[in-house]
């Protein structure tokens, strides 16, 4: 029921989460937690932003994107098998029961002997579109799927870029990432 993302032991994992700020710099508090989103909060918080900045983080967890533009995707550095599990991204939109809640499943695989990333795996991880139904309680948070949204020309370009070990950063900076607001 939640979107699944994969990474290998020793790599950085990327869990996408986006919103569209009402105006540049008009930020919304966001929290990331380990565990499924509870009714009001974020579970065991690993990172938190307020209306201005990242105001709490723990080691290995950081925002690599431009959170001031609503890219609050979480990067987990040098993952281990213990990092597997459900993560909660909660966009704490002001108002009555306006929160956006996303449960994302991270699956950590043992490191491969020959680290040759496949197009499909990295492509999906870098270009997710999260389709969600909205609800006010944990049971009503449901993620419906992860769909790539990119054309064939871009796939051709990406095939070359996939050889680059900086894939996640390059793809995210390419401007093709989908945002939800």
């Amino acid at each position: 029921s939640e979107v699944e993302y994969r990474a290998e032991v020793g790599q950085n994992a990327y869990l996408p989460c986006f919103y569209t700020p009402a105006a540049p710099g008009n930020l919304v508090p966001v929290c990331w937690g380990k565990g499924a989103c509870p009714v009001f909060e974020c579970g065991n918080v690993v990172l938190r932003t307020d209306e201005r900045d990242v105001n709490y983080w723990t080691s290995r967890y950081w925002l690599n994107g431009d959170f001031r533009k609503g890219d609050v995707s979480l990067t987990i550095e040098n993952v281990t098998l213990a990092d597997s599990g459900i993560y909660c991204c909660r966009i704490q939109i002001p108002g009555i029961m306006n929160d956006e809640k996303f449960n994302l499943k991270l699956v950590i695989k043992p490191a491969k002997v020959t680290p040759a990333p496949t197009l499909q795996r990295d492509f999906t991880a870098a270009f997710p579109r999260m389709l969600t139904t909205r609800g006010h309680g944990p049971a009503e948070t449901q993620t419906l799927g992860s769909l790539p949204d990119i054309n064939l020309t871009q796939i051709s370009t990406l095939a070359n870029e996939l050889r680059d070990s900086r894939l996640a950063n390059d793809l995210r900076d390419s401007g093709a990432t989908i945002r939800i607001g």
Partner: antibody, heavy 119, light 111 residues
């Protein structure tokens, strides 16, 4: 030591307004969801409002549009503004701290303040 | 709304015996493997006190004679052996969905 102290209760006429305050101390207030829970004389407990650490608001249908909850993280105070009061709002009102990381249940409660709505 | 039905409404027990209070939810309160059900104790003139969270976790400082069990829609609070200090009202509460809801309470009395 975690402490929650409610104030502002009293006697109000139907249709009137009142603002309750909850002064918190002994913990990092801004990190916690805060709730108001009321208890009618028959001892039943009813959750009436919550505000998350990020400022999102939650209410049951019974008070939606009449009550609002707010917080002042600089002063460590949570408020419950109650408008269009009715006789069935008469109750003991407790301020409660939501458990860290969850918020949906309550590990500390104040002693309560009494609201009586009567003409 | 999730309706919580507590039974019995009152329970008379002898000191040293076991007291069992039940709480049934109108729908499941299971969420990613956790049962989002709590139990509180309330003595006259005092606010409620958290005893058990997530169905079976005993809150810090709560005596080991209190235990919780159950999953899905059916939950129980057990007190064994009952002591005089346990005479109070007991409430269940779900944190699965807004609105948060409580059971009507069970009054524990001495036989």
């Amino acid at each position: 030591e975690v402490k929650l102290v409610e104030s502002g209760g009293g006697l109000v006429k139907p249709g009137g307004s009142l603002k309750l305050s909850c002064a918190a101390s002994g913990f990092t207030f801004s990190r916690y969801a805060m709730s108001w829970v009321r208890q009618i004389p028959e001892k039943r407990l009813e959750w009436v409002a919550a505000i998350s650490s990020g400022g999102s608001l939650y209410f049951p249908d019974s008070v939606k549009g009449r009550f609002t909850i707010s917080r002042d993280n600089a002063r460590n105070i949570c408020y419950l503004q109650m408008n269009s009061l009715r006789s069935d709002d008469t109750a003991m009102y407790y301020c409660a701290r939501g458990r860290e990381a969850d918020g949906g249940y309550f590990d500390y409660w104040g002693q309560g303040t009494t609201l009586t709505v009567s003409s | 709304d999730i309706v919580l039905t507590q039974s019995p409404a009152s329970l008379a027990v002898s000191l040293g015996q076991r007291a069992t209070i039940s709480c049934r939810a109108s729908e499941s309160v299971e969420y990613y493997g956790t049962s989002l059900m709590q139990w509180y104790q309330q003595k006259p003139g005092q606010p409620p006190k958290l005893l058990i969270y997530a169905a079976s976790n005993v809150e810090s400082g709560v005596p080991a004679r209190f235990s919780g069990s159950g999953s899905g829609t059916d939950f129980s609070l057990n007190i064994h052996p009952v002591e005089e200090d346990d005479i109070a009202m007991y409430f269940c509460q779900q944190s699965m969905k807004v609105p948060l809801t409580f059971g009507a309470g069970t009054k524990l009395e001495l036989k």
